[in-house]
């Protein structure tokens, strides 16, 4: 058994301590809707593969003003390699499709949970 | 071993409140929201709020707001839900149930605990 | 709220037997979409989570499937531990809501 902020679960390896901040910052978002989460701003939706986290923060960064997703902006500049400025895009975009931030914080926990049940947590 | 036990059946009169307890163990209970859901005698299953034990933030079914009230005392890994002006209707099992730890489902569930309201 | 609406109430079936229960929702919910199954006195227990993945320990004749507002619980091949009642769930907005159920009895 391994343990991820007490998730018990057989088989992957736990994944870093800040890996395990973003997933919590994350669900707390989702839980935490009292109202659209960023005035219902929409983001470009990515391809979930590799370099998610750069795509991802390419995706958010255009949301300005909006405090419920600063840390997790932060969190996800923790993850990519690069710097990532607002207008920026990679290949990862789906570039015809833009949806809530909320939804799109959940697509990116049920990637991140897809990557834990395979054993992918890098 | 993994489980949430709640507190034990309750009968009380129309007006009246109920406080019902759901204790974790096996768990880092702050790891984990903690949701509320009740099911009338022979009824479906209906989602009343959700509470993080972490900072005690919540969101309440809009149908219950104003009568439900959630809480936590993270020094016994216990959540609360009680329930206020009690209706007949209100007669129901109510279930806490753990919310997956990436959000998306109710992996664990309490036993439930059956609340009578009659007169 | 998002309303799910679950077909059939109840069916009669044996052991062996191949059975479908579906679940509508009012509007799209982007296969954020949970199974759940409960037996008397019991309370639920999760079955399959964004329409299509099995949770760890589930028997695999279990499988979910669908996509917009149309969703499929199937079980390839009934077992005696599968009469039950059947929940989805929405998880795509809040507030999170049921269906009405479909429960599964002996023929």
């Known amino acids: 058994l391994t343990c991820l902020g007490g998730f018990a679960s057989p088989g992957p390896v736990p994944p870093s301590t800040a890996l395990r901040e973003l997933i919590e910052e994350l669900v707390n978002i989702t839980q935490n809707q009292k109202a659209p989460l960023c005035n219902g701003s929409m983001v470009w939706s990515i391809n979930l593969t590799a370099g998610m986290y750069c795509a991802a923060l390419e995706s958010l960064i255009n949301v300005s003003g909006c405090s419920a997703i600063e840390k997790t902006q932060r969190m996800l500049s923790g993850f990519c390699p690069h710097k990532v400025s607002a207008g920026q895009f990679s290949s990862l975009h789906v570039r015809d499709t833009k949806i809530e931030v909320a939804q799109f914080v959940k697509d990116l926990l049920l990637h991140l949970k897809k990557l834990f049940r395979e054993g992918q947590f890098n | 071993e993994v489980q949430l036990v709640q507190s034990g059946a309750e009968v009380k009169k129309p007006g009246a409140s109920v406080k019902v307890s759901c204790k974790a163990s096996g768990y880092t209970f702050t790891s984990y929201w903690m949701h509320w859901v009740r099911q009338a005698p022979g009824q479906g299953l209906e989602w009343i709020g959700n509470?993080?034990?972490?900072?005690?933030?919540?969101i309440y079914n809009e149908k219950f707001q104003g009568r439900v009230t959630m809480t936590r005392d993270t020094s016994i890994s216990t959540a609360y839900m009680e329930l206020s002006r009690l209706r007949s209707d209100d007669t129901a099992v109510y279930y806490c149930?753990?919310?997956?730890?990436?959000?998306?489902?109710?992996?664990?569930w309490g036993q439930g605990t059956t609340v009578t309201v009659s007169s | 709220d998002i309303q799910m609406t679950q077909s059939p109430s109840s069916l009669s079936a044996s052991v062996g037997d191949r059975v479908t229960i579906t679940c509508r929702a009012s509007?799209?919910?982007?296969?954020?979409l949970n199974w759940y199954q409960q037996k008397p006195g019991k309370a639920p227990k999760l079955l399959i989570y964004?329409?299509?993945n099995l949770e760890v320990g589930v028997p695999s004749r279990f499988s979910g499937s669908g996509s917009g507002t149309d969703y499929t619980l199937t079980i390839s091949s009934l077992q005696p531990e599968d009469f039950a009642t059947y929940y989805c769930q929405q998880d795509n907005r809040f507030p999170y809501t049921f269906g009405g159920g479909t429960k599964v009895e002996i023929k």
């Open positions: 509470i993080n034990p972490k900072g005690g933030s919540n």
């Open positions: 149930a753990r919310l997956d730890y990436f959000g998306d489902s109710f992996d664990l």
């Open positions: 509007q799209g919910i982007r296969n954020y």
């Open positions: 964004y329409a299509s």
